[in-house]
């Protein structure tokens, strides 16, 4: 629109005047005025803004606890959070990762269908008919019943979804 | 404090192309727009247009669109104003200046509160 | 466009001296002018803004006044560093066009 029927993008109303915002990693010191321009600080070691603003003080960066399971993925700048992840084998409970939770494990007759990550649990599926799991385990996919045929044996017991068939020789007295 | 400094004198032949920079310092560069003026010899102010140092987002008086692209770097502080095809009509002293805005009663009145030095472009064949 | 005419267009006038220089819009333009000195080789500089309000750093005996179409500049008592040129500006509607400027010379 012309003329301008509000401050700019990157300023704020003040006094009658519109100001320039401190821009990402610096804070606000004092207001511009009449005389002078906005005046800005940058944020400290361990503090950020991630946005243009007028906030008089920084952020902290998230502090990642190791008491909580969690760890530094990316330290933050002055213009970034620290992003905190999970220790091998555990996984965020939120996606801010406050806490960290052990990866989930597939019962027997369950196999991995996505292993976790430091952001998702494990995703287990029902093992089908032809597949197995004995374990408890967060890795192990549904493995395929053995196929006695190819070992030129014969099912002796039925595979379920929890156990593999039982293979055994072929009864020598069939003709 | 503001200072707008801009780049020295130029002499171009009709046709060829100019390129004319601005440098700020003092102030955040890229929350206030920058406005081009030019001035022929013995004339009056001519407004060609502006840009927002933000987005990089121009907008070009009418009489020079398609000849003028003004640019900007923010991570030296620093505007560009490129005026092509010149002719001899071209030959003026050249300003960047910085839009200042203003509310009262209910209104945002802007106006230009800092300006460069002027860069004299002489177009001559 | 927007036409802007000043006048006069020159004015000798004398130290001390009260010297009003005018502005005339072509249309209506509220309160959305400026006022501008310039001096030989010089930029411009920003005197008054929003047509009355008075640019910081800038002499009190400058004035600016009027809406609408019609605008006037005033130097309540004219001083040595007074004498140079004066556009007007409107910044209502693009291209934000000047007055054709007014030279303030030593009478």
């Known amino acids: 629109p012309e003329p301008p029927t509000a401050c700019r993008e990157k300023q704020y109303l003040i006094n009658s005047q519109c100001c320039s915002l401190c821009q990402p990693g610096q804070k606000l010191v004092s207001d511009c005025t009449e005389f002078t321009e906005t005046e800005c600080l940058p944020c400290g070691e361990s503090e950020f803004l991630d946005t243009w603003n007028r906030e008089t003080h920084c952020h902290q960066h998230k502090y990642c606890d190791p008491n909580l399971g969690l760890r530094v993925q990316q330290k933050g700048t002055s213009e970034t959070d620290t992003i905190c992840t999970c220790e091998e084998g555990w996984h965020c409970t939120s996606e801010a990762c406050e806490s960290c939770v052990l990866h989930r494990s597939c019962s027997p007759g369950f196999g991995v269908k996505q292993i976790a990550t430091g952001v998702s649990d494990t995703i287990c599926e029902p093992c089908p008919v032809g597949f197995f799991s004995n374990v408890s385990s967060a890795f192990e996919k549904c493995h395929p019943w053995t196929s006695c045929e190819t070992k030129d044996l014969v099912v002796q017991q039925a595979g379920t979804n929890k156990t593999d068939v039982v293979c055994g020789p072929q009864d020598r007295l069939r003709a | 404090q503001v200072q707008l400094v801009q780049s020295g004198a130029e002499v171009k032949k009709p046709g060829a192309s100019v390129k004319v920079s601005c440098k700020a310092s003092?102030?955040?560069?890229?929350?206030?727009?920058m406005y081009w003026v030019r001035q022929a010899p013995g004339q009056g102010l001519e407004w060609m247009g502006w840009i927002n140092p933000d987005s990089g987002a121009p907008t070009y008086a009418q009489k020079f669109q398609g000849r003028v692209t003004m640019t900007r770097d923010t991570s030296i502080s620093t505007a560009y104003m490129e005026l092509s095809r010149l002719r001899s009509d071209d030959t003026a002293v050249y300003y960047c200046?910085?839009?200042?805005?203003?509310?009262?009663?209910?209104?945002?009145?802007?106006?230009?509160?800092?300006w460069g030095q002027g860069t004299l472009v002489t177009v001559s064949s | 466009d927007i036409q802007l005419t000043q006048s006069p267009s020159f004015l000798s006038a004398s130290v001390g001296d009260r010297v009003t220089i005018t502005c005339r819009a072509s249309?209506?333009?509220?309160?959305?002018l400026a006022w501008y000195q310039q001096k030989p080789g010089k930029a411009p500089k920003l005197l008054i803004y929003?047509?009355?309000t008075l640019q910081s750093g800038v002499p009190s005996r400058f004035s600016g006044s009027g809406s609408g179409t019609e605008f006037t500049l005033t130097i309540s008592s004219l001083q040595p560093e007074d004498f140079a040129t004066y556009y007007c500006q409107q910044l209502v509607s693009y291209p934000w066009t000047f007055g054709q400027g007014t030279k303030v010379e030593i009478k």
């Open positions: 929003a047509a009355s």
């Open positions: 200046a910085r839009e200042k805005i203003y509310y009262g009663s209910g209104n945002y009145y802007p106006s230009f509160d800092y």
């Open positions: 249309q209506g333009i509220s309160s959305y």
């Open positions: 003092g102030y955040t560069f890229a929350g206030y727009y």
